[in-house]
Interface confidence: low
């Protein structure tokens, strides 16, 4: 039901131990009560107990107090549940009866077993407060209180609003006195089904399935899901949106793994050579004099080119080389001769001719011999 009318019997006084007829009970009035709750009537009249009825066992004899069982067992207060919107008005009939035996059914009692009957009617709002009442007749007095409260999960002024607290997939809330939902900490939304994510979790790129969580959508990472994930394999690049690979300066290629500035990153040229980038991972070294090789890593010997002529011998020096000329020759490369044909400079049968430019003579060598003086045998 949506609510319950509660009637708390407190004390019944029947000092003389008599019935409504005035006849005394023998040996005393073993008293029980019948309660009828119905719709509002200006004059409470017999008829159906439209809101419910309840009877008690024998509570005592003649005059007695009734124990308060407010723990909710249903004994006292008496419970009259209803499953409709409480109208705010009612009629109540309380009858006290004498039970000569153990059978309390109406048909088992003599009609004159009635001790007293009271009837009240009026307005009654839903609430926790008890209304205390006392009804007195010439022979009896009944002290009682009553109220209407909503059943579990029903709320509002008329117990018409159903609200069941829950903490599961369908919602995380408790119910306010008016029946509105009050979300549990960490939850939001109309039915408190949406978790409140970790503070700062990116609205678009992050989400959560429970409070204070921040799970990243594909392509995003970081505690707050505000860092994009670059293209898989991106080596020297960054992203502004997921799966991008925007190359850092000096890098190229799909994965930014191709070095466009090899000279700066690797300094491949040795011995003071000048480096020039010439494409992805390619460069050119311009060697200083005296060096050779791709990276100018090899020191050059200038005597290797046999610069000395006329049998001159070559000696390497820090700043180059030096030719030691045989007798009769001079010059940087021993290219100048002090001899003439008269000095018979040609060996091995070579014939001498006089010359005017540079050298003083020239030898014409026979077969199998060469050199400026035909001094070398050809193998």
């Amino acid at each position: 039901g949506s609510g319950v009318f509660q009637l708390q019997l407190q004390e019944f006084i029947n000092e003389r131990g008599v019935l409504a007829s005035g006849r005394p009970c023998e040996p005393g009035c073993r008293t029980f009560f019948r309660v009828c709750l119905k719709h509002f009537q200006a004059v409470v009249s017999p008829g159906p107990c439209t809101f419910g009825t309840v009877s008690t066992p024998v509570l005592g004899t003649n005059s007695f107090a009734v124990r308060d069982d407010s723990s909710g067992g249903g004994r006292n207060p008496l419970q009259l549940p209803f499953n409709f919107t409480w109208p705010g008005t009612f009629s109540l009939i309380i009858e006290a009866w004498h039970a000569p035996g153990d059978d309390l059914r109406p048909e088992a009692l003599p009609p004159d077993a009635l001790i007293s009957k009271i009837a009240i009617q009026g307005s009654l709002a839903v609430g926790q407060n008890w209304l205390l009442d006392e009804q007195t007749s010439t022979l009896t007095r009944l002290r009682y209180s009553y109220r209407v409260i909503c059943s579990d999960n029903y709320y509002g002024d008329n117990c018409s609003r159903l609200c069941k607290k829950r903490n599961d997939h369908f919602g995380h809330y408790v119910c306010q006195p008016d029946g509105n939902l009050s979300c549990l900490p960490g939850w939001t939304g109309e039915y408190c089904q949406q978790p409140i994510c970790l503070s700062g979790c990116h609205e678009q790129n992050g989400y959560c399935s429970k409070p204070a969580e921040c799970l990243c959508r594909p392509g995003w990472q970081g505690r707050l899901c505000n860092e994009c994930i670059p293209h898989n394999g991106c080596r020297h690049g960054t992203c502004s949106t997921p799966w991008q690979c925007t190359c850092d300066e000096g890098w190229g290629g799909l994965f930014c793994d191709q070095d466009l500035n090899y000279c700066t990153h690797h300094s491949p040229c040795k011995n003071g050579a000048t480096c020039s980038n010439s494409g992805q991972r390619s460069y050119t070294c311009t060697c200083r004099p005296g060096y050779t090789g791709v990276d100018c890593e090899l020191e050059l010997s200038e005597c290797d080119s046999n610069p000395c002529r006329n049998g001159g011998s070559c000696k390497d020096q820090e700043d180059g080389y030096h030719c030691l000329c045989p007798p009769g020759y001079y010059g940087l490369h021993c290219e100048h001769s002090t001899l003439s044909c008269a000095d018979s400079p040609c060996f091995n049968g070579g014939s001498c001719r006089e010359r005017n430019q540079g050298a003083n003579y020239a030898c014409e060598c026979p077969p199998n011999f060469t050199g400026s003086n035909c001094e070398k045998k050809v193998d």
Epitope: F64, A65, G74
Partner: antibody
Framework: EVQLVESGGGLVQPGGSLRLSCAAS????????ISWVRQAPGKGLEWVGV????????EYADSVKGRFTISADTSKNTAYLQMNSLRAEDTAVYYC???????????WGQGTLVTVSS | DIQMTQSPSSLSASVGDRVTITCRAS??????VAWYQQKPGKAPKLLIY???FLYSGVPSRFSGSGSGTDFTLTISSLQPEDFATYYC?????????FGQGTKVEIK
């Protein structure tokens, strides 16, 4: 004739469990409440708890709350006292009694002895 | 919880004596008090309920009185079968509580 008959008592070790039964006859079981009352050897009476067999509503003494459970089977007119996590101080004769609406015990069973000891 | 304090805890009396046992509640319990008699090895028996009402089948020499916090059980003329332990009980509110008992012995 109103009758209440308890059974199920015996010796049990501390921490153990036991279930007592109270078979009722001679009155309308669902119209009355059934209480359990215990009496330690040489001591006074202590109310343990009560059940309304009709609705299943129960109440318990603080000393047994959370350890003892009272239930009823209306088809058998029998009330039960399930006792778990028993302690030496639970040693007593256990009575079931008819608890009339005023809270008085007008009919009692003969009692059953529960001894909790290692 | 409401405490019920009985006095005396024991008494010796002779057959024919008038015996009075008192019970004091720690707070007002109106007239929601009962008295029980218990003999060794037996279950208690209801004597008086609602403070002063004699339970069916109980001899008229037993009577009860009082309201609020002070209650009395009186046996007007003690009989041999009345030697037993007597307990008061309140059922006004909260858990039902008993007095500690009064043992009536033969003098």
């Amino acid at each position: 004739e109103v009758q209440l008959v308890e059974s199920g008592g015996g010796l049990v070790q501390p921490g153990g469990s036991l279930r007592l039964s109270c078979a009722a006859s001679g009155f309308t079981f669902t119209d009355n409440w059934i209480s359990w009352v215990r009496q330690a050897p040489g001591k006074g009476l202590e109310w343990v708890g009560v059940i309304n067999p009709n609705s299943g509503a129960t109440e318990y003494a603080d000393s047994v709350k959370g350890r003892f459970t009272i239930s009823a089977d209306t088809s058998k007119n029998t009330a039960y006292l399930q006792m778990n996590s028993l302690r030496a101080e639970d040693t007593a004769v256990y009575y079931c009694a008819r608890d009339n609406f005023g809270g008085y015990f007008d009919y009692w069973g003969q009692g059953t002895l529960v001894t909790v000891s290692s | 919880d409401i405490q019920m304090t009985q006095s005396p805890s024991s008494l010796s009396a002779s057959v024919g004596d008038r015996v009075t046992i008192t019970c004091r509640a720690s707070q007002d319990v109106s007239t929601a008090v009962a008295w029980y008699q218990q003999k060794p090895g037996k279950a208690p028996k209801l004597l008086i309920y609602s403070a002063s009402f004699l339970y069916s089948g109980v001899p008229s020499r037993f009577s009860g009185s009082g309201s609020g916090t002070d209650f009395t059980l009186t046996i007007s003329s003690l009989q041999p079968e009345d030697f037993a332990t007597y307990y008061c009980q309140q059922s006004y509110n909260g858990p039902s509580t008993f007095g500690q008992g009064t043992k009536v012995e033969i003098k």
